[in-house]
Interface confidence: medium
């Protein structure tokens, strides 16, 4: 089938005191090969500081996955989610507050 770019959504949730968990979700993409990783100051974090979900079919002939990491509250601006899919890439910031969800459909 043709390439379908992912919808990327970054959320944040409270973790332990002074920390938050930031999660980057990519959904509705095809084919299934994708790079999704957290970056600090532009460089990728190591695998052992991130948690990945499996790349799973979402029932519409496309796929979804996620990556999460824990960061210090107040340092959100240093972190971005980097996505690469079918030769295209995009970078997504951490939203500034709990109620904010950033959606970005990459074209």
């Amino acid at each position: 089938g043709s390439t379908v770019p992912p919808m990327v959504n970054v959320t944040r949730s409270e973790a332990s005191e002074g920390n938050i968990t930031v999660t980057c979700r990519a959904s509705s993409f095809y084919p299934r090969n994708i790079i999704l990783t957290w970056r600090q100051d532009g460089v990728s974090l190591s695998h052992d500081t991130q948690q990945w979900g499996d790349v799973l079919p979402d029932g519409n002939g496309t796929y979804q996955t996620w990556v999460a990491t824990r960061i210090c509250r107040g340092e959100e601006q240093r972190f971005t989610c980097y996505m690469e899919h079918s030769g295209n890439h995009s970078t997504h910031p951490v939203p500034s507050g709990n109620s904010h969800h950033h959606h970005h459909h990459h074209h």
Partner: antibody, heavy 122, light 112 residues
Framework: QGQMQQSGAELVKPGASVKLSCKTS????????ISWLKQKPGQSLEWIAW????????SYNQKFTAKAQLTVDTSSSTAYMQFSSLTTEDSAIYYC???????????????WGQGTLVTVSA | DVLMTQTPLSLPVSLGDQASLSCRSS???????????LEWYLQKPGQSPKLLIY???NRFSGVPDRFSGSGSGTDFTLKISRVEAEDLGVYYC?????????FGGGTKVEIK
């Protein structure tokens, strides 16, 4: 590699502000992190802050948080640094520099502008 | 902040000599991702600095192979195997592992 062309020398009075520019060409501006650095005559370098052109996100050296403000104009592929409440201690050459990242492989200041001399004098 | 200390302050050399520059950090500069972001820059009089070495030992594009970087933890070295006239200037080490990123005070390589 591309080019990074900085604005010309500035002579400013104490207490004033100055806005320096760094116009880029030859690379995809929005994919890049741009840092600003300070060098006083005959001294070493200090990192001031970076800005990610793709989102406008910034990270500052705490020493400069009240002094510097970084912005970008993606339409003209230009990065700016506004320096406020200037004192003679701010007299220096200010450089912009582009990071060169790929994954965990990083070169922080791979490509530099030519520098802008700021002189603060009454 | 991580303090970067360079020695010597000045290094007089003869052209063709080997030069060895030292850089010591006040704490371990391994990044959270496991890499050590230690870089070396050369600044010639009246010019902007130029990147020579990144990630301790990797030569940046266009940098001659007479430049080599080594070290780990807190102790790092830049070696120039045969100094040429174009190598004269001030060398700075830099750490990009911990914010705020910091430079050493510099080593001036000059003709003996």
């Amino acid at each position: 590699q591309g080019q990074m062309q900085q604005s010309g020398a500035e002579l400013v009075k104490p207490g004033a502000s100055v806005k320096l520019s760094c116009k880029t060409s030859g690379f995809t501006f929005s994919d890049n992190y741009i840092s600003w650095l300070k060098q006083k005559p005959g001294q070493s370098l200090e990192w001031i802050a970076w800005i990610y052109a793709g989102t406008g996100g910034t990270s500052y050296n705490q020493k400069f948080t009240a002094k510097a403000q970084l912005t970008v104009d993606t339409s003209s592929s230009t990065a700016y640094m506004q320096f406020s409440s200037l004192t003679t201690e701010d007299s220096a050459i200010y450089y912009c520099a582009r990071h060169d990242y790929y994954g965990t492989s990083g070169a922080w200041f791979a490509y530099w502008g030519q520098g802008t001399l700021v002189t603060v004098s009454a | 902040d991580v303090l970067m200390t360079q020695t010597p302050l000045s290094l007089p050399v003869s052209l063709g000599d080997q030069a060895s520059l030292s850089c010591r950090s006040s704490q371990n500069i391994v990044h959270i991702n496991g890499n050590t972001y230690l870089e070396w820059y050369l600044q010639k009089p009246g010019q902007s600095p130029k990147l020579l070495i990144y990630k301790v030992s990797n030569r940046f594009s266009g940098v001659p192979d007479r430049f080599s970087g080594s070290g780990s933890g807190t102790d790092f070295t830049l070696k120039i195997s045969r100094v040429e006239a174009e190598d004269l200037g001030v060398y700075y080490c830099f750490q990009g592992s911990h914010v705020p990123w910091t430079f050493g005070g510099g080593t001036k390589v000059e003709i003996k």
